[in-house]
């Protein structure tokens, strides 16, 4: 899937009312110095790229964070102003179901949600030169 | 689909290193997450390093630091440098690609890494 075709001023709006509110309320009681983070992403389809592998996907130390508000609202987003996004989802949403379990916040997962926000605000700037 | 080919692992004494590749053919590598496992005697497979396609990279505590996971996706590889290798190291090595977004996941078959003096 490509996301080429999104409308990246809408998702935008939908990050800064109410995605953004959500990551910050999941990283709340961690200092925002805690994370060194590095993350980058050239331009708005490759951030949503890299967003939707962070997001739905798991990574060492974080199993999932597919259930968490961020990320259904996140979810959500894309298919309304993401052309055929939905249609790609069918096999992941099946396999969620299957898997139920008990929601645990790591250190991992919070790096990881951090990470989150840096594409998300590299998302925001897209005129911004690479650093 | 893509398939795996994992290569590079030996035996090594305590202290040394190693690299691991995974080769990959067929479509889809490029926007994949991928993943090296291991997999120790009478231990469940553990996920401990991850790499998403713009490269940003995670890692449990018991690899960080020493052990490197990097991509080459004009070259469809993907590497594992392991620094200061530890008896504990030891075990069966998978790579493994997963699309982000039916999180289909393809497999390796496995490389051998024994740490021992």
């Known amino acids: 899937y490509d996301f080429t075709n999104c409308d990246f001023e809408k998702i935008k709006a939908a990050y800064l009312s109410t995605i953004s509110k959500d990551l910050i309320t999941y990283m709340s009681g961690t200092k925002s110095t805690e994370f060194n983070n590095t993350v980058s992403c050239s331009n708005r389809p490759h951030c949503l790229t890299e967003i939707q592998s962070l997001t739905f996907n798991p990574t060492a130390g974080c199993a999932s964070l597919a259930k968490e508000m961020f990320a259904m609202k996140t979810k959500a987003a894309l298919a309304i102003w993401c052309p055929g996004y939905s249609e790609t989802q069918i096999n992941a949403t099946q396999a969620m179901k299957k898997r139920r379990k008990r929601k645990v916040t790591t250190n991992k997962c919070l790096e990881q949600v951090s990470q989150l926000q840096g594409l998300w605000r590299r998302f925001n700037r897209p005129l911004l030169k690479q650093q | 689909e893509v398939q795996l080919v994992e290569s590079g692992g030996g035996l090594v004494q305590p202290g040394g290193s190693l690299r691991l590749s995974c080769a990959a053919s067929?479509?889809?590598?490029?926007?994949?997450?991928l993943y090296w496992y291991r997999q120790a005697a009478g231990i469940e497979r553990e996920l401990i390093a991850s790499?998403?396609?713009?490269?940003?990279?995670n890692y449990v505590d018991s690899v960080k630091g020493r052990f490197t996971i990097s991509r080459d996706n004009s070259e469809n590889t993907m590497y594992l440098q392991m620094n200061s290798l530890r008896a504990e190291d030891t075990g069966v090595y998978y790579c493994?690609?997963?699309?982000?977004?039916?999180?289909?996941?393809?497999w390796g078959q496995g490389t051998l890494v024994t740490v021992s003096s």
């Open positions: 493994a690609s997963r699309n982000i977004f039916d999180g289909t996941t393809e």
């Open positions: 067929g479509s889809g590598f490029g926007v994949n997450i």
């Open positions: 790499i998403t396609s713009g490269g940003i990279t």
